[in-house]
Interface confidence: low
């Protein structure tokens, strides 16, 4: 988890939530400022701190760096997905570095919803579901704490290469699962190797390549509900010639256009006065 | 222009053999699973065999298995049915067809099919 | 294997009336279902795919519907070119199956 990626883990250190590429974040609601030589807001800013401290340590940690790098804004756009998305995550928080807002802080026992956006970057996939090293994409991981939350939205976001001319491109995505004895056609008996759960007719006029979401609500529910049943998806995406215009190569050369999936999630929290 | 031509049938007595042959054009003949579907006189359709788009992989009807062979020479982009100890219940227009996807040879339907050819046998 | 029925095995319609055809799977094959047309002395030519998708080319008075085990093909309005056989064929389950066939012929 070294180099670029890692640098970019670390600059949304701030935003980062769970673990395997799961990245999340959410706006802070502006609250008024506290009135000078109050003690309790004194502890809640030092609390905060260490807090921080502690989030930022964990990240750190798990990317094997020693210290956040120092990274700009332009630097943290280059590295992260070239994608809608992100990018409006990105404008929507100003992204300054590490810079954090100040948190929110409840009356007692008042429940309170916030909704936020989960990030998940594609992963290599297991090897019980690969044939000959393939496919090597796409894994999704998600932690404990957004598969406990209400999905509102899932989003599976793909990358298509562009094309010369315009072009009819058929979208497949397949559900892998573990190959377990001899395979049939058409899918049948023990060996099914992968089940089909979407498939879409894309017009491409683009030259310059396409950003293309798929609904994934559904299947991220089946996924949170069953969490070993997520062996990770074949993404195909075939022109009339039978050429794969998909981006799931996980290697170098195709940085910031691997598949992702962006989560809306509704966490209810209940906080109470410390 | 997808396109696939198919040569070989003819009359055969039972027992016989026979081979038909499918070429293919207009598309990356290599990236794609194939299968074979044939059509008994006045009657339904009925899918016989598959072949993954590499060749490692083949797949038969119960009513062929064992007689009948798929298999495809992705350098000369042709697709073949060997058939071996024919049955009069094996007349019918044999078509090859293209699988829709690439890949493997699950859950697919067919696009684009050959023209078909007849395959007799009859003592 | 999944049996596939298909009814009524012949539709007597004319020009520019609704066609209904169609198409119930021995078990569930969810979405997993063609449709082609075959014309005499042709092959077929694929028209519906998993289910409700039309294929390229393939005219908008075509439409399929269902899911599970029920399927329906429509034709909203019959021009001459569209009498002919129409098979569904389902690929949830090996063996890859299709069903008898509906003659849709000139009344």
């Known amino acids: 988890a070294e180099g670029p990626a890692a640098a970019a883990a670390a600059a949304a250190a701030a935003a980062a939530a769970g673990v395997g590429g799961e990245r999340s974040s959410r706006p802070a609601p502006s609250v008024a400022p506290e009135p000078d030589g109050c003690p309790v807001c004194v502890w809640r800013q030092h609390s905060r701190e260490l807090r921080l401290e502690s989030i930022k340590s964990q990240i750190l940690s798990k990317l094997r760096l020693k210290e956040a790098p120092n990274i700009s804004r332009e630097v943290v756009k280059q590295l992260l997905p070239k994608a809608p998305p992100l990018q409006q995550i990105l404008d929507l928080h100003d992204f300054q570095g590490d810079a954090l807002q100040p948190e929110d802080f409840l009356e007692e026992d008042e429940y309170h919803a916030t909704t936020e956006t989960v990030i998940s970057m594609a992963q290599e996939t297991d090897p019980a579901v690969q044939t000959d090293g393939s496919p090597l994409c796409c894994h999704f991981h998600f932690s404990p704490k957004v598969m406990f939350t209400k999905v509102l939205k899932a989003q599976l976001w793909v990358y298509l290469r562009p094309v010369p001319r315009p072009a009819t491109v058929y979208l497949q995505i397949l559900r892998l699962k573990p190959l377990t004895g001899e395979g049939t056609a058409g899918g049948g008996g023990g060996g099914r190797r992968h089940i089909r759960i979407r498939s879409l007719k894309i017009e491409l006029h683009s030259r310059s390549g396409h950003w293309q979401s798929i609904d994934f609500k559904q299947v991220l529910h089946s996924w949170f509900r069953q969490p070993q049943s997520n062996w990770g998806i074949e993404i195909n995406a075939f022109d009339p010639s039978g050429t794969d215009l998909a981006v799931t190569s996980l290697g170098p050369g195709a940085e910031g256009l691997h598949p992702f999936m962006e989560l809306r999630v509704l966490e209810n929290t209940k906080r109470s006065r410390r | 222009q997808v396109q696939l031509v198919q040569s070989g049938g003819g009359v055969v007595q039972p027992g016989r053999s026979l081979r038909l042959s499918c070429a293919a054009s207009?598309?990356?003949?290599?990236?794609?699973?194939m299968h074979w579907v044939r059509q008994a006189p006045g009657k339904g359709l009925e899918w016989v065999a598959v072949?993954?788009?590499?060749?490692?992989?083949?797949y038969y009807a119960d009513s062929v298995k064992g007689r009948f062979t798929i298999s495809r020479d992705n350098s000369k982009n042709t697709l073949y049915l060997q058939m071996n100890s024919l049955r009069a219940e094996d007349t019918a227009v044999y078509y090859c067809?293209?699988?829709?996807?690439?890949?493997?040879?699950?859950?697919?339907?067919?696009?684009?099919w050959g023209q078909g050819t007849l395959v007799t046998v009859s003592s | 294997e999944i049996v596939m029925t298909q009814s009524p095995a012949t539709l007597s319609l004319s020009a520019g009336e609704r066609a209904t055809l169609s198409c119930r799977a021995s078990?569930?094959?969810?979405?997993?279902l063609a449709w082609y047309q075959q014309k005499p002395g042709q092959a077929p030519r694929l028209l519906i795919y998993?289910?409700?998708n039309r294929a390229t080319g393939i005219p908008a008075r075509f439409s399929g519907s269902g899911s599970g085990t029920d399927f329906t093909l429509t034709i909203s309005s019959l021009e001459p070119e569209d009498f002919a056989v129409y098979y569904c064929?389902?690929?949830?389950?090996?063996?890859?199956?299709f069903g008898g066939g509906t003659n849709v012929e000139i009344k």
């Open positions: 067809a293209k699988d829709f996807w690439s890949g493997y040879p699950q859950y697919n339907w067919f696009d684009p």
């Open positions: 078990q569930s094959v969810s979405n997993y």
């Open positions: 998993d289910a409700s």
């Open positions: 207009g598309f990356t003949f290599s990236s794609y699973a």
């Open positions: 064929q389902q690929y949830g389950s090996a063996p890859l199956t």
């Open positions: 072949i993954s788009y590499d060749g490692s992989n083949e």
